[in-house]
Interface confidence: low
Amino acid sequence: DAHKSEVAHRFKDLGEENFKALVLIAFAQYLQQCPFEDHVKLVNEVTEFAKTCVADESAENCDKSLHTLFGDKLCTVATLRETYGEMADCCAKQEPERNECFLQHKDDNPNLPRLVRPEVDVMCTAFHDNEETFLKKYLYEIARRHPYFYAPELLFFAKRYKAAFTECCQAADKAACLLPKLDELRDEGKASSAKQRLKCASLQKFGERAFKAWAVARLSQRFPKAEFAEVSKLVTDLTKVHTECCHGDLLECADDRADLAKYICENQDSISSKLKECCEKPLLEKSHCIAEVENDEMPADLPSLAADFVESKDVCKNYAEAKDVFLGMFLYEYARRHPDYSVVLLLRLAKTYETTLEKCCAAADPHECYAKVFDEFKPLVEEPQNLIKQNCELFEQLGEYKFQNALLVRYTKKVPQVSTPTLVEVSRNLGKVGSKCCKHPEAKRMPCAEDYLSVVLNQLCVLHEKTPVSDRVTKCCTESLVNRRPCFSALEVDETYVPKEFNAETFTFHADICTLSEKERQIKKQTALVELVKHKPKATKEQLKAVMDDFAAFVEKCCKADDKETCFAEEGKKLVAASQAALGL
């Protein structure tokens, strides 16, 4: 139903608090370098304007689209040209090209300082001094660093952030109460951001059809008792929500997500028996809970898939009549029977089935041609099963840090042109698959591991897209969304790579390493490991292990020394010389 004023409609639906928060997120995700105060000023101006439209929908400019209103507001920023360079050219365009232009300039790796958390007393004072500003700063800082963060979910994070401070700033031991909560929010936030980034990449790079296929598979696993028509309706609505959020339409996205949660809860009897608890929660918690809800039990006595999709004489007729509907039904039926498969595996199977039908339905004897299609699935299923088995064994043998190091070496050899910080970040995240998924029983390992790896490899893809340096990465990232992981797995050592010149500065360390947290110290060591492999890509595991062990001993020794800086200078030179000799540099 059309509204005279879109901005008034969204303001009334969402309420002032959510409206202001979502506009702040939207602006911070577009203009990531703008100071906090500038964004607050813009948000206040938009909010005041929205209120005039609520009072009179016919008032001047109230009939304009949200993109027009928000784009006009962003284009009033005086320093646009000097801060953002060519992004300022977007302002010369008309909608919808202007918004597309802003979207294209979103930066997945903005040059912003690392956020450093102050002491608990300082934060609690800031929280009590001005709670509203404190929470706005949280939204602003997260949104500008994660320009694709799922906005309605960020509201949920902010609610938990506020709750943590409200509770812990009154506690006897503030730090013991608050710090674990903030760590949990940080880690969950990074994971949430990365998962949403994959959804947006799926929509933007591979199109709506690819996203819908993903959604059919995932929702069919989650709601195996729901009928196909119900799953299709949910997929359509979910696609609209994510298309809006990925497109910067955050008010519409949040509004439609709330409607979808309402629909799911009103129809839970025909969707899933697991939704009851979620549906008793307030809106933000409810939506989050539904998104994370466990898979419902599979209906008993589901018939064999072969009857409808292989043995039936109507396979080609049904396929020809409505290809995507028939493939969607195949995907739905396969996914609801296989919660033990990853979504990407289910999509590979559906693609294989589609390719077979395309070929066979044009053949002289279609049935004879596609009769053995399910046999083609076997190697596709076994490949991730074997890979996960091998890597979980390696993880259990090495532990997380050394498992990450093994992946660092493996991936640096595959794509040595990629920047060291990206290789370290991505390999560390790939390595976390061990502690995240290997503890699960067999039936849950593959969906946990392979779908998580898809999220992490997408991080590599979006970071690499900003500064492309490797044709192999581009190829794996762009050819097929569902085959990204197998594509990277299949890469061997890059024989064309010319080793990096040795630079002693790269391996010069100082006493500041002694005061770093364990995590930061690991990152320093892993950075050195990547650089070693870039200098000596043919180095064996044994050689690298020996050098890394020497390095660890060197750091430990110098951190215990009285004159740490002198120790690092003198022993460091010896270590560099010994490492060069050991690796033949």
Epitope: P35, P113, V116
Partner: nanobody
Framework: DVQLVESGGGVVQPGGSLRLSCAAS????????MGWFRQAPGKEREFVSA????????YYADSVKGRFTISRDNSKNTVYLQMNSLRPEDTALYYC?????????????????WGQGTLVTVSS
């Protein structure tokens, strides 16, 4: 209100050292987080280092770690920045800043009071 006055800037050769000082007046110095920021010609202002009220925590930008050291003397209402192994890219106007309430140390908008700056030039 807090007034901040920086000193100690100057011209130095690459590899050389300088010590910047920032004297505060007009507030209870020991209740403020103190930070150093810098702005090179034609560039944006960037975080350099910060120190908590009682010197328990110190923070540094990656580009200065291991070379710069921040310290404070609450009895003298002064914060210092010892800069060693200076490089040409350290050339900038260095600002001292004070923050009473802060959510993040590295964000310049968190700092309520600023000095006028002291110029550091690293050149051979």
């Amino acid at each position: 209100d807090v007034q901040l006055v920086e000193s100690g800037g100057g011209v130095v050769q690459p590899g050389g050292s300088l010590r910047l000082s920032c004297a505060a007046s007009g507030g209870t110095f020991s209740t403020y987080v103190m930070g150093w920021f810098r702005q090179a010609p034609g560039k944006e202002r960037e975080f350099v280092s910060a120190i908590s009220q009682n010197s328990i925590h110190t923070y540094y930008a990656d580009s200065v770690k291991g070379r710069f050291t921040i310290s404070r003397d609450n009895s003298k209402n002064t914060v210092y920045l010892q800069m060693n192994s200076l490089r040409p890219e350290d050339t900038a106007l260095y600002y001292c800043a004070a923050s009473r309430f802060t959510s993040w140390y590295t964000a310049d908008y968190e700092y309520d009071y600023w000095g006028q700056g002291t110029l550091v030039t690293v050149s051979s």
